[in-house]
Interface confidence: low
């Protein structure tokens, strides 16, 4: 806490400018009007304030807005955002995507901080769902964002938003997350033709049920082994040897190298040896 002291004569700030970098902490506290600071927040980032000086400016805003900052101030916080705690951010009501982008830009290149996570949570909850524009923005800044959400949170993603998802955005998703995302992707891409559909749906197939895999096996998709290994075990088990052969196409030879791994191992165990022998791979059920 900075002590309340009178502002020295002639030092009262008329505007937020570079002269303030020469003010001591107590002078900033005494001579900078909080309302002036709030209206000229966009200037703060252009001025090389020290971290200690930024603490004073934050303190002034906190006093002016004890219930949380208005969006007009939040949008121009810039590097002052890094001084905010998750508790501060929980008081905000951020509705503008531009505000979100501005604050994410400040943290760009760093891992998602608790502050950013809280900001995103507040923003998404305020919107009621994770719409396409928001998802586009978040995955651009944090490719792993989607996979940081719980299955419950993912359930609020509308199918239309799935168009914004790139394969790399799903790299760290676990099976239960893909279980939620797959039906949404299937709905989103349902009007595409066979080969285009497979390209789009491929990254989501870790959540696909058996009947969808059977349907894909009839479309000459030539699924690669990496994708096959990410399929749900319970979805793979009922597939026949012929269906797996059609599903994988020329990649079927890769089953041998994966015969001890799930889901291939479990699938092999449930096949008739005669059927497995037709593959000519030496697989033992």
């Amino acid at each position: 806490e900075v002590e309340k002291t009178a502002c020295p004569s002639g030092k009262k700030a008329r505007e937020i400018d570079e002269s303030l970098i020469f003010y001591k902490k107590w002078e900033l506290e005494a001579c900078v009007d909080a309302a002036l600071l709030a209206t000229q927040m966009d200037r703060v980032n252009a001025i090389p304030f020290t971290y200690e000086q930024l603490d004073v400016l934050k303190h002034k805003l906190d006093e002016l807005y004890p219930q949380g900052y208005p969006e007009s101030v939040i949008q121009h916080l810039g590097y002052l955002f890094l001084k905010m705690s998750p508790e501060d951010i929980r008081k905000w009501n951020v509705t503008s995507l531009e505000t979100l982008k501005a604050l994410l830009e400040v943290n760009k290149g760093h891992e998602m901080s608790p502050q950013v996570a809280t900001l995103i949570d507040r923003f998404v909850k305020g919107r009621g769902q994770l719409d396409k524009d928001t998802l586009d923005t978040l995955t651009a800044f944090y490719p792993g964002y989607l996979c940081s959400l719980s299955p419950e949170e993912l359930s609020s993603v509308p199918p239309s938003s799935i168009w914004a998802v790139r394969p790399q955005d799903l790299d760290t998703c676990d099976p239960r997350q893909l279980d939620v995302l797959y039906p949404k992707a299937r709905l989103a891409f349902q009007n595409m033709n066979g080969s285009e559909y497979f390209v789009k749906i491929q990254s989501f197939l870790g959540g696909a049920p058996t009947e969808d895999l059977k349907a894909l096996s009839q479309q000459n998709v030539s699924m690669d082994l990496a994708t096959f290994m990410k399929l749900r075990t319970d979805a793979v088990l009922p597939l026949t040897v012929a269906e797996v052969q059609k599903l994988l196409g020329p990649h079927v030879e890769g089953l041998k190298a994966e015969e001890r791994h799930r889901p291939v191992r479990d699938w092999i165990l449930r096949q008739r040896q005669d059927d497995l022998d037709t593959l000519g791979l030496g697989l033992q059920g």
């Epitope: 940081s148 719980s150 299955p151 760290t172 676990d174 791994h261 799930r262």
Partner: antibody
Amino acid sequence: QVQLQESGPGLVKPSETLSLTCTVSGGSVSSYYSTWSWIRQPPGKGLEWIGYIYYSGSTNYNPSLKSRVTISVDTSKNQFSLKLSSVTAADTAVYYCAREGKNGAFDIWGQGTMVTVSS
Amino acid sequence: DIQMTQSPSSLSASVGDRVTITCRASQSISSYLNWYQQKPGKAPKLLIYAASSLQSGVPSRFSGSGSGTDFTLTISSLQPEDFATYYCQQSYSTPLTFGGGTKVEIK
């Protein structure tokens, strides 16, 4: 051969926070196929799943404990941790860390650590 | 949450006996059912995963069957080292849940 080892205080006072760490050796916490769980067992009772974490940091907690639980992962140290806040005597248990592996089961367990909540 | 109900809660048997433990899920869990053995003072040990697959290193006298909601763990010929408590666990959906356990005691 992947092994897990729990560490942390054996005695915690009521209303305080229980903190445990699980160190993974012989393998990586960043395995695509694994989630890393905490499971507890009160004396003479059954097993209760607390929650899991994936190496990306994605978590899933048991709703019965969600308001008090935080699980985190440190890939650089090959560790994951449990924090359980506002503990009471009912939280006295053996706490296990475990790997949910490619087969969808807890195939590797730590030896367990007994945590007593008492003043 | 999916409730897992094991029966019986305890049983007495002799060496060489065939022992069957059942586990029922409150809703369908496909084949996402695992079985564990726990001895006093030790961590549980995985026996069977995906309802019927034997974990590496586990004796072949242990077997599992079932799908959907009803599952069975069978020990074809009980050995002295098999006296322990057995738990089923579903990994179909979170929260992951365990059965209450079945204690196998010496008759």
